[in-house]
């Protein structure tokens, strides 16, 4: 069964005299390891002797005998899968068939490999893509069916004999599938490379030439053109003639059509290599080129800029920017078609020449309202002076100017009056569209720029207005100076700092918070009676009779304001004590008698004490002393004592007489 052994190696290996051969090889034997290996050169089987005739280049047997040739030929394999061989150096007569005679425990096998050794290094082979087009990247491949570890080589690319700048990528393969050295060069050919010779040169490690392959580049490209013009500078005046000629310097494949273009647009009925322009006009100024096509595509010449010269045309003014805001910068540009370009300009503002302005542009760094108006210009070149165009309008916008707030009322203004104010301004662009007032209030604006304040408050101090267009301008605030009667009038005790006791020195102050005008008068009143006209009311020694309700008044030219009534309270010890008797000071025994301790005190008496005619205190502490039933023994003089927080007071003696009843008299 011939499938028992499996070998993999290149079918044929190539080399040249003096180089080397590296033969990558793998195998798989039926069973076990390799027992012997013989490498034959051109082995021939002899049927008669059942032996192989041929040179034994290498022998590795069980007994280990090795011929001297083994120095040149090396078996680099192993006993189970690698059968790689090396011959170094390799000779011309090594060409032919190599026979690898291998023996395992149970089988013998002969594997054949072809070796092709040439006298001189054979040339590499250049592979080109089927078509090469200009500016399209292509890969040039140089392939050599050779690689050997013991013999380094290099592949170099040359263009017309000169090394190519582009970096080549060299790769080698020494595998059971293939043995080669390959160099790949990425290259973007230009049309000028058409017909040029590309060489791939095989060199040894020292750069010595060994062999080469050459190819001629066939670079497909669009037609390459040259344009010639008469006159050569392509500058003419209206009415002159111009001739342009198109020459094809290269085309691959041959060209098929010719056309002329002006500013990128094809010229009708111009299909020859010469373009004649007679009596040119300024409209014929522009960029001309010729276009010639082949199967690759159209090729265009460089552009010729034909300049037909003429005097400036009527000018127009462009303003950057209008309307302009006061204080901003503005640029004016004079636009006039002319060839050559204008060299001098004259500028006008509202018809009047602007001195010292001769440039194409006028720059005003800070615009003011008076800069508004019409701007026009005139352009001039070597062929003449143009006409002044219609001009352009500059609108200068600014906030309202000189804004003032005006009080329409007669002065002075009194609290509660209706006040009318107006907001005035001097000028504005654009027009004023609205007004603002400070401070804000629930006020009427009967018409634009007028403010009506009904029932003006005492505390309305200042008002300011703003006139607004795109911006608001504020006026300086105006003072209303509202006049009003004294405010917040009140009575304030200055001394004593604590509660008032009878006999104290007392001062009361009439206070107010504000008054306009400031000049005021004071009035003090108690129970409708005028007491004084100073801001203070003084008592050297207060008495309980001074207690009561006090008011003060403050008035100015606008009106008078009263304080709230203020109660003056005087504290004093119990006084005017007396004992009253009910039903009288003479009472029949057995009846009821009530003694009452009457007094005047502030604060009221908090504690009573009763005494008899012996100044003996009685066990009673209320205001009333009730005797029931009254006895004759109760007859006598009684007095009481009252106490409050200020002090004590006592009454005079009052005598109670208790007389016998008729019954008692009857029993006697």
């Amino acid at each position: 069964d011939s499938s028992k052994w499996v070998f993999e190696h290149p079918e044929t290996l190539y080399a040249w005299e003096g180089a080397c051969v590296w033969i990558p090889c793998t195998y798989r034997a039926l069973d076990g390891d390799l027992e012997s290996f013989i490498l034959f050169h051109n082995p021939e089987y002899n049927k008669n002797t059942s032996k192989f005739d041929g040179t034994r280049l290498y022998e590795s047997t069980k007994d280990g005998k090795v011929p001297s040739e083994q120095k040149r030929v090396q078996f680099l394999g192993d006993k189970n899968k690698n059968c790689t061989l090396s011959i170094h150096p390799v000779h011309l007569n090594d060409s032919g068939q190599l026979g690898l005679r291998m023996e395992s425990k149970t089988e013998k096998w002969m594997e054949r490999i072809h070796l092709n050794v040439s006298e001189r290094p054979f040339p590499p082979h250049i592979q080109l893509p089927p078509e090469i087009q200009e500016s399209q990247e292509v890969t040039l491949t140089c392939l050599l069916n050779f690689s050997c570890y013991g013999y380094p080589i290099q592949l170099q690319w040359l263009l017309e004999g000169v090394p190519m700048r582009q970096a080549a990528v060299t790769s080698t393969s020494l595998t059971i599938k293939s043995v080669f050295t390959r160099s790949e060069l990425k290259f973007s050919p230009q049309w000028s490379h058409h017909g040029k010779i590309v060489t791939c040169q095989l060199q040894d490690a020292d750069g010595k030439f060994l062999s080469n392959d050459t190819v001629q580049l066939n670079v497909k490209h669009t037609p390459k053109l040259e344009i010639k013009v008469t006159p050569s500078d392509a500058i003419v005046r209206e009415g002159d003639s111009v001739t342009m000629t198109c020459e094809v310097s290269s085309s691959n494949p041959e060209y098929t059509t010719v056309s002329w273009l002006k500013d990128g647009t094809s010229l009708k009925k111009q299909n020859t290599f010469t373009l004649n322009l007679r009596e040119v006009t300024k409209d014929q100024s522009g960029k001309y080129c010729c276009q010639v096509s082949n199967d690759v595509g159209p090729g265009r010449s460089e552009e010729v800029f034909l300049q037909v010269q003429y005097a400036p045309e009527p000018s127009t003014v462009q303003i950057l920017h209008s309307p302009a805001v006061e204080g901003s910068q503005v640029e004016f540009l004079c636009m006039s078609l002319a060839n050559p370009l204008p060299t001098n300009y004259t500028w006008y503002h509202n018809g009047k020449e602007m001195q010292g302005r001769t440039e194409e542009k006028v720059h005003i760094p800070k615009i003011l309202p008076w800069h508004a108006g019409t701007y026009s210009c005139v352009a001039e070149n070597i062929l003449g002076t143009g006409q002044r165009g219609p001009g352009a309008e500059l609108d200068v916008q600014y906030p309202p100017k000189k804004v003032t707030t005006v009080i329409q009322n007669p002065m002075p203004i009194r609290e509660g009056d209706t006040v009318t104010l107006s907001c005035n301004y001097n000028s504005s662009n654009p027009s004023v569209t609205r007004y603002e007032w400070k401070p804000h209030g629930a006020w009427e604006e009967p018409s634009l720029g007028v403010l009506k304040i009904q029932n003006v408050g005492w505390d309305n101090t200042t008002i300011a207005c703003a006139a607004c267009n795109s911006w608001c301008s504020w006026a300086s605030p105006v003072a209303l100076n509202v006049q009003y009667a004294p405010r917040d009038v009140r009575v304030r005790k200055i001394k004593p700092l604590s509660e008032i006791h009878s006999g104290n020195s007392v001062s009361l102050q009439c206070d107010f918070s504000s008054s306009h005008p400031k000049e005021v008068q004071f009035f003090w009143e108690k129970n409708g009676r005028l007491l004084g006209k100073e801001s203070q009311l003084n008592f050297d020694s207060i008495s309980p009779e001074d207690a009561g309700s006090y008011s003060c008044w403050v008035n100015n030219s606008i009106g008078q304001t009263a304080s709230k009534a203020w109660t003056l309270e005087v504290l004093y010890a119990p006084r005017r004590l007396r004992v009253s008797m009910s039903p009288g000071d003479q009472v029949m025994e057995g009846k009821s008698a009530t003694l009452t301790c009457e007094s005047d005190a502030n604060p009221p008496v908090s504690h009573y004490t009763w005494f008899d005619w012996n100044n003996q205190s009685l066990p009673y502490h209320s205001q009333k002393l009730r005797l029931e039933p009254v006895k004759v023994q109760h007859s006598g003089a009684y007095w009481c004592q009252g106490t409050n927080s200020v002090g004590k007071g006592r009454s005079p003696l009052s005598t109670l007489t208790v007389y016998y009843s008729p019954e008692t008299i009857g029993r006697r």
């Epitope: 011939s2 089987y45 059942s50 032996k51 395992s104 149970t106 089988e107 013998k108 096998w109 002969m110």
Partner: nanobody, 128 residues
């Protein structure tokens, strides 16, 4: 180690017959190829007849075709060469060879190739 022992040689008249035997030891006989070689005085050893044990394919040198027959007895590990119509040219020492099968690419050889473990041989003389 292969051990070969040839026997059955002798002197025979032309036209006569001989049967050579070769007993083999030390190998897996079934899969091997076997052959009979001869070497006449002053000549190179040459193939007489071979047989592949695996499939029974045989080979005969042109000079012996139709006269000699190779056979085997696997049970006895023995190879035979039946020689009939012997000629004086058949005179030689006859050697037995038993070897591993040999493949050359797709070819499977019938004879032992590059065999070098020879026995002592057996002399066959054909003479009147």
């Amino acid at each position: 180690q292969v051990k070969l022992e040839e026997s059955g040689g002798g002197l025979v008249q032309p036209g006569g017959s001989l049967r050579l035997s070769c007993t083999v030891s030390g190998v897996t006989f079934d899969y091997y190829v076997m052959g009979w070689f001869r070497q006449a005085p002053g000549k190179e050893r040459e193939v007489v007849s071979c047989m592949r044990n695996s499939d029974g394919v045989t080979y005969y040198a042109d000079s012996v075709k139709g006269r000699f027959t190779i056979s085997r007895d696997n049970a006895k590990n023995t190879v035979y060469l039946q020689m009939n119509s012997l000629k004086p040219d058949d005179t030689a020492i006859y050697y037995c060879a038993v070897d591993k099968p040999f493949y050359d690419g797709g070819n499977y050889y019938t004879c032992p190739v590059d065999f070098d473990s020879w026995g002592q041989g057996t002399q066959v003389t054909v003479s009147s």
